[in-house]
């Protein structure tokens, strides 16, 4: 059993989640990658790249865009116009078969809340990144990064078991609470 630290990202409705999933290019450069959401115990594949992966050939499925950079060992995931119902646990995986996927670390717990003014994308910007400087408050410090390790609430004592044949991955003691500021 491999223990993963779940990272929590807080967004407002209408914003864009942009993550990068890191992989060993020697192993997985030519593999298909997928973005999945955990629904109960079973993951649901939301989008997957073509095979073989090629640089700068984005795959778009609704509001999700995947762009693989096999030369750099990175998969870029964009989820635009986030909605409250998008909240949940997401993972990048190496997609080998619908029932068999290798999880790329770390899982992301996405929390989407209504904008303070009640309108989607009510922040200055609708795309955003994460602040990188530790902060003693939960205050949003700037649009591109988040305060790593700014705990905005008591981390839940939870364990999520990802159902992938041959391996059980437990997500325990969510400690990396990330506050994501905004930019349009």
């Amino acid at each position: 059993t491999t223990e993963l630290t779940e990272e929590k990202y807080e967004y407002k409705e209408g914003q864009t989640l942009e993550v990068k999933c890191d992989y060993a290019l020697e192993k997985y450069a030519n593999s298909r990658k997928a973005w999945q959401k955990m629904e109960g115990k079973m993951p649901k594949i939301l989008a997957k790249t073509e095979r073989p992966s090629e640089n700068s050939h984005p795959v778009q499925v609704g509001r999700i865009t995947l762009e693989d950079y096999p030369d750099h060992g990175l998969l870029q995931v964009r989820m635009t116009n986030l909605q409250v119902e998008d909240s949940g646990l997401y993972q990048c995986v190496i997609y080998q078969h619908p029932k068999e996927s290798h999880v790329l670390f770390n899982p992301i717990c996405l929390v989407v809340t209504k904008g303070s003014s009640g309108t989607p994308g009510s922040s200055e910007n609708s795309t955003q990144n994460v602040y990188r400087t530790p902060s003693t408050t939960a205050k949003a410090l700037g649009p591109r990064y988040t305060s790593p390790r700014t705990v905005t609430q008591a981390p839940p004592e939870s364990t999520v078991v990802v159902s992938t044949p041959g391996s059980e991955i437990n997500l325990t003691n969510v400690t990396d609470i990330i506050r994501v500021p905004v930019f349009n």
């Epitope: 993550v19 990068k20 890191d22 290019l25 770390n106 990144n129 990188r132």
Partner: antibody, heavy 122, light 107 residues
Framework: QVQLVQSGAEVKKPGASVKVSCKAS????????INWVRQATGQGLEWMGR????????GYVQNFRGRVTMTRNTSISTAYMELSSLRSEDTAVYYC???????????????WGQGTLVTVSS | DIQMTQSPSSLSASVGDRVTITCQAS??????LNWYQQKPGKAPKLLIY???NLETGVPSRFSGSGSGTDFTFTISSLQPEDIATYNC?????????FGGGTKVEIK
């Protein structure tokens, strides 16, 4: 405070290799990418690639692929960039720079090492 | 690769002048653009990230704007300590690319 401290200047012969180190302090080393950027005298900045210190996975710009290797030692919070088969045009200042968090699509270089001059001359 | 074209390549202005530098991307990069200041013999220093956000500790006379392919960096009132080369950098797509730099001098 966050600091990146690089190893000293190097003089190398064509065909040799050089390994530059970058020691990080003041933050959690494994939470942020380390990038390498070089600058030849009087020239612009050129990104060479990035490494995720947590996983050790790295990716390189095409111009350098096959010649560059980026590694790390997490126990001493140090990143390394090794460039092999050196030629005169590799003479440049090599910088390490901290990028965004490893899981976020952010390549904003907020802290830089002081630079290491690598001179390639016969 | 995305090409970043900076202009002018150099400029000379008086203390107190408003200085504007432009950076043009060869394709849409949204707001994924950063600006750095580099003084001779020193490492670059982040000034502006994501087009318009001022890095902590950077004087408010520096600002940035733009979106898509056209971006502007402004020094509202040039100071003697602003003598440096300024570089833009995009990170919308890999590989990351920098502009050619703009050298700012005092008249």
């Amino acid at each position: 405070q966050v600091q990146l401290v690089q190893s000293g200047a190097e003089v190398k012969k064509p065909g040799a290799s050089v390994k530059v180190s970058c020691k990080a302090s003041g933050y959690t080393f494994t939470s942020y990418d380390i990038n390498w950027v070089r600058q030849a005298t009087g020239q612009g900045l050129e990104w060479m690639g990035r490494m995720n210190p947590k996983s050790g996975n790295a990716g390189y710009v095409q111009n350098f692929r096959g010649r560059v290797t980026m590694t790390r030692n997490t126990s001493i919070s140090t990143a390394y960039m090794e460039l092999s088969s050196l030629r005169s045009e590799d003479t440049a200042v090599y910088y390490c720079a901290r990028g965004g968090r490893t899981s976020i699509w952010s390549f904003v270089f907020d802290y830089w090492g002081q630079g290491t001059l690598v001179t390639v001359s016969s | 690769d995305i090409q970043m074209t900076q202009s002018p390549s150099s400029l000379s202005a008086s203390v107190g002048d408003r200085v504007t530098i432009t950076c043009q991307a060869s394709q849409d990069i949204s707001k994924h653009l950063n600006w750095y200041q580099q003084k001779p013999g020193k490492a670059p220093k982040l000034l502006i990230y994501d087009t318009s956000n001022l890095e902590t500790g950077v004087p408010s006379r520096f600002s940035g704007s733009g979106s898509g392919t056209d971006f502007t960096f402004t020094i509202s009132s040039l100071q003697p300590e602003d003598i440096a080369t300024y570089n833009c950098q995009q990170y919308d797509k890999l590989p990351l690319t920098f502009g050619g730099g703009t050298k700012v001098e005092i008249k």
